[in-house]
């Protein structure tokens, strides 16, 4: 899977979309999970409604929401009040039994609010005596990483 980068501004909302083949994934619930470590598991953040027919209903877990357009074949995840610690590698998944197919690998990047000069990422440069933690992700809006290239490790 290629990895698609979604960039959002700290404090704002970020919408991540994961298109899929609606016929192939007919009847399947979906999930949004966060990759833990290079070879670690993908930890479930939120999943669609237990009843597949009600997948269009938005479900929240904390500041993360998920909704599924099963007819159009688009899973949408909303990250509200985006924070630097939200940056990292995620997956949109299609669930079947105890198995999960990856619909899309997503790299979430959190950009500093240009009006907010707190330490929130790679966009601003602090004073001489300070430094900021490098985001350790590849950068570009709506860019897919090259096949086989893994943008790891993410900032957690």
């Amino acid at each position: 899977h290629n990895t698609t980068v979604f960039q959002g501004v700290a404090g704002q909302s970020l919408q991540v979309s994961c298109p899929y083949d609606s016929m192939k994934h007919w009847g399947r619930r979906k999930a949004w999970c966060r990759q833990l470590g290079e070879k670690g598991p993908c930890q479930r953040v939120v999943s669609t409604h237990n009843l597949w027919l009600l997948s269009f209903l938005r479900r929240w877990n904390g500041s993360t929401a998920i909704t599924d357009d099963t007819l159009g074949g688009t899973l949408t995840i909303t990250l509200r009040n985006l924070q630097p610690h939200d940056a990292g590698l995620y997956q949109c998944q299609s669930l079947h039994g105890s198995e999960a197919d990856t619909l899309r690998k997503v790299l979430v990047e959190v950009l500093a609010d240009p009006l907010d000069h707190r330490d929130a990422g790679d966009l601003w440069f602090p004073g001489e005596s300070e430094s900021f933690e490098d985001a350790h992700v590849e950068h570009s809006i709506s860019r897919s990483l090259l096949e086989g290239e893994i943008p790891f490790p993410p900032t957690s």
């Epitope: 470590g37 290079e38 070879k39 610690h85 990292g88 790679d122 966009l123 440069f125 430094s131 900021f132 933690e133 490098d134 350790h136 992700v137 590849e138 950068h139 570009s140 809006i141 860019r143 990483l145 090259l146 290239e149 893994i150 943008p151 790891f152 490790p153 993410p154 900032t155 957690s156």
Partner: antibody, heavy 123, light 112 residues
């Protein structure tokens, strides 16, 4: 194979500018940070800044900010470092260095370096 | 920025003998993702620097196993188990956990 080929040596007058180029080949230029590091005669290495060619994002060392401009041309896979208002203490060898992207087993270090460009600032 | 202090600044070693270089940093290099981005470079006379070890202890392909890196947090060490003539040059520690990236002052290794 990965190669970074830099432009030739330059002799400049104080107050002028210099633009050093770094032509990359053998890898996806757009998706790796390119760094510029300098080394004054007999001194250590000093990081000047970096650019992500895919979107032009840059970071600079605070010390040099304002005098250094790092750019990249994706069409020719070439990165540039321009240093303005040159002073004698800017006499140094300037290196471009690719930042190895974060793949499993490899990580965020400068794995390929150009051959260096000597910039001499003298009146 | 992160200040990196290398010791010693110069080292004269008999071939076949071990050598050790220390690198201390002004703040922890552990990234919030758990990784430590401390690297070692060697600059041989008249050459560009070359990457030897990345992420504290990972040898670059082609680097002899007599080179090893260790450490954590703010305290790191590069060891050469048996120095050879081709190892001469200046060794630099460097960090890429935080921007701006920084280098140590360098340690010059000479052969006795």
């Amino acid at each position: 194979q990965v190669q970074l080929v830099q432009s030739g040596a330059e002799v400049k007058k104080p107050g002028s500018s210099v633009k050093v180029s770094c032509k990359a080949s053998g890898y996806a230029f757009s998706s790796h940070w390119m760094n510029w590091v300098r080394q004054a005669p007999g001194q250590g290495l000093e990081w000047m800044g970096r650019i992500y060619p895919g979107d032009g994002q840059t970071n600079y060392a605070q010390k040099r900010q304002g005098r250094v401009t790092i750019t990249a041309d994706e069409s020719t896979s070439t990165a540039y470092m321009e240093l303005s208002s040159l002073r004698s203490e800017d006499t140094a060898v300037y290196y471009c260095a690719r930042l190895l992207r974060n793949q499993p087993g490899e990580s965020y270090a400068m794995d390929y370096w150009g051959q260096g460009t000597l910039v001499t600032v003298s009146s | 920025g992160v200040v990196m202090t290398q010791t010693p600044l110069s080292l004269s070693v008999t071939p076949g003998q071990p050598a050790s270089i220390s690198c201390r940093t002004s703040q922890s290099l552990v990234h919030s993702n758990g990784y430590t981005y401390l690297h070692w470079y060697l600059q041989k006379p008249g050459q560009s620097p070359q990457l030897l070890i990345y992420k504290v202890s990972n040898r670059v392909s082609g680097v002899p196993d007599r080179f090893s890196g260790s450490g954590s947090g703010t305290d790191f060490t590069l060891k050469i188990s048996r120095v050879e003539a081709e190892d001469v040059g200046v060794y630099y520690c460097s960090q890429s956990t935080r921007v701006p990236y920084t280098f140590g002052q360098g340690t010059k290794l000479e052969i006795k």
